[in-house]
C-alpha cells in the first residue's frame, strides 16, 4: 500500500497566463493538497503535455466545464 504521508505530491508553483483553446485540452485534475503552495488545475493536452493553470481564471473554469460535459456525453 502506498504511504499517504510519504507519497509524492504534484504541486504547481507557476500558472500559465496564456489562454488555451479548450480543443487542445484532453482532461484536467484539481490540486488541492495542503502540501502545495496554492490550489491549481493541471490540464493534460491532446499531445499529453501538462499545464498548470489558475482555477480563478474564467477561461480555466470554462475549460473545466467543457471537459466535464464532454466526459458526461456518451459517444454514439
Amino acid at each position: 500500500q502506498p504511504d499517504a504521508i510519504n507519497a509524492p505530491v504534484t504541486c504547481c508553483y507557476n500558472f500559465t497566463n496564456r489562454k488555451i483553446s479548450v480543443q487542445r485540452l484532453a482532461s484536467y485534475r484539481r490540486i488541492t493538497s495542503s502540501k502545495c503552495p496554492k490550489e491549481a488545475v493541471i490540464f493534460k493536452t491532446i499531445v499529453a503535455k501538462e499545464i498548470c493553470a489558475d482555477p480563478k481564471q474564467k477561461w480555466v473554469q470554462d475549460s473545466m466545464d467543457h471537459l466535464d460535459k464532454q466526459t458526461q456525453t456518451p459517444k454514439t
Epitope: 507557476n14 500559465t16 497566463n17 496564456r18 489562454k19 488555451i20 483553446s21 479548450v22 480543443q23 487542445r24 484532453a26 493536452t45 491532446i46 499531445v47 503535455k49 499545464i51 477561461w59 464532454q70
Partner: antibody, heavy 120, light 113 residues
Framework: QVQLVQSGAEVKKPGASVQVSCKVS????????MHWVRQAPGKGLEWMGG????????IYARKFQGRVTMTEDTSTDTVYMELSSLRSEDTAVYFC?????????????WGQGTLVTVSS | DIVMTQSPDSLAVSLGERATINCKSS????????????LVWYQQKPGQPPKLLIY???TREFGVPDRFSGSGSGTDFTLTISSLQAEDVAVYYC?????????FGQGTKVEIK
C-alpha cells in the same frame, strides 16, 4: 479585435542580423501566443517558431534553431524576431501571427508582413 | 514532422463553377476523443497576409462566404469553393496544428479559366 503592426522593410548584407518587431493592440501580449511565419518570394508559408503554452516557452522550427531568437516586451506589448547569420535564402516576407481566441495552433490574426532583403 | 501535400498545385476554373483543392497529411491529425481534426485552410491574395477561412477542418470563420466549405478527416481533406467568384482568385494553404512544428501545404493557386 486584436491588431498586429510590424516594423518596416529591411535590407541587410549576408552574415548580418535583422530584428523585426510586431506591436500588439486590442489584447494584452501576456494572454496571447505569438508566432512567426515567413514566405520567400513566390513560395509558400513556413512556420519559424513561437510561444507554446504547452511547453511554457518559445519553441523554434529545427531549421532555424540557433539562428533565430523570439522575445517579448510585455511593457510595450511588442514581440521581436531576430534572425542572425543572414544568407540570400532568408530574403522573405516575415509575418507575426496569433490566435486571438486562445492558443490552438492556427492563426486568425496576422501582421501586415515585413520584407527582409538579404543582398551583397 | 507532419508533411502536408496539396493537390493540384494550380487550377483554372470558370466563374460560377466548382473549385476543389485537396490536402493530405503524412499522419492523422484527428484526435478521436473529441473527434476534432486539427486542420485549417487559409486564403492569401498577392501582397496580403493569409486570411483564415476554415478551422477544425470544416468550421467556417466568421464572415467567410458560405460558398467555401471544408471536409475530410484523418489524413485526407478538401476545400471546396462551390461557385467561384472573381474575388476568390488567390493561393490557398492547408495547415495542421495537431503536433508542433506546425506545417503548411505548398499552396494551390486558383485562377479563372
Amino acid at each position: 479585435q486584436v491588431q498586429l503592426v510590424q516594423s518596416g522593410a529591411e535590407v541587410k548584407k549576408p552574415g548580418a542580423s535583422v530584428q523585426v518587431s510586431c506591436k500588439v493592440s486590442g489584447d494584452t501580449l501576456t494572454e496571447l501566443s505569438m508566432h512567426w511565419v515567413r514566405q520567400a518570394p513566390g513560395k509558400g508559408l513556413e512556420w519559424m517558431g513561437g510561444f507554446d503554452p504547452e511547453d511554457g516557452e518559445t519553441i523554434y522550427a529545427r531549421k532555424f534553431q540557433g539562428r533565430v531568437t523570439m522575445t517579448e516586451d510585455t511593457s510595450t506589448d511588442t514581440v521581436y524576431m531576430e534572425l542572425s547569420s543572414l544568407r540570400s535564402e532568408d530574403t522573405a516576407v516575415y509575418f507575426c501571427a496569433t490566435d486571438s481566441r486562445g492558443y490552438s495552433g492556427y492563426f486568425d490574426n496576422w501582421g501586415q508582413g515585413t520584407l527582409v532583403t538579404v543582398s551583397s | 514532422d507532419i508533411v502536408m501535400t496539396q493537390s493540384p498545385d494550380s487550377l483554372a476554373v470558370s466563374l460560377g463553377e466548382r473549385a476543389t483543392i485537396n490536402c493530405k497529411s503524412s499522419q492523422s491529425v484527428l484526435y478521436s476523443s473529441n473527434n476534432n481534426n486539427y486542420l485549417v485552410w487559409y486564403q492569401q491574395k498577392p501582397g496580403q497576409p493569409p486570411k483564415l477561412l476554415i478551422y477544425w477542418a470544416s468550421t467556417r470563420e466568421f464572415g467567410v462566404p458560405d460558398r467555401f466549405s471544408g471536409s475530410g478527416s484523418g489524413t485526407d481533406f478538401t476545400l471546396t469553393i462551390s461557385s467561384l467568384q472573381a474575388e476568390d482568385v488567390a493561393v490557398y494553404y492547408c495547415q495542421q496544428y495537431y503536433f508542433s512544428p506546425w506545417t503548411f501545404g505548398q499552396g494551390t493557386k486558383v485562377e479563372i479559366k
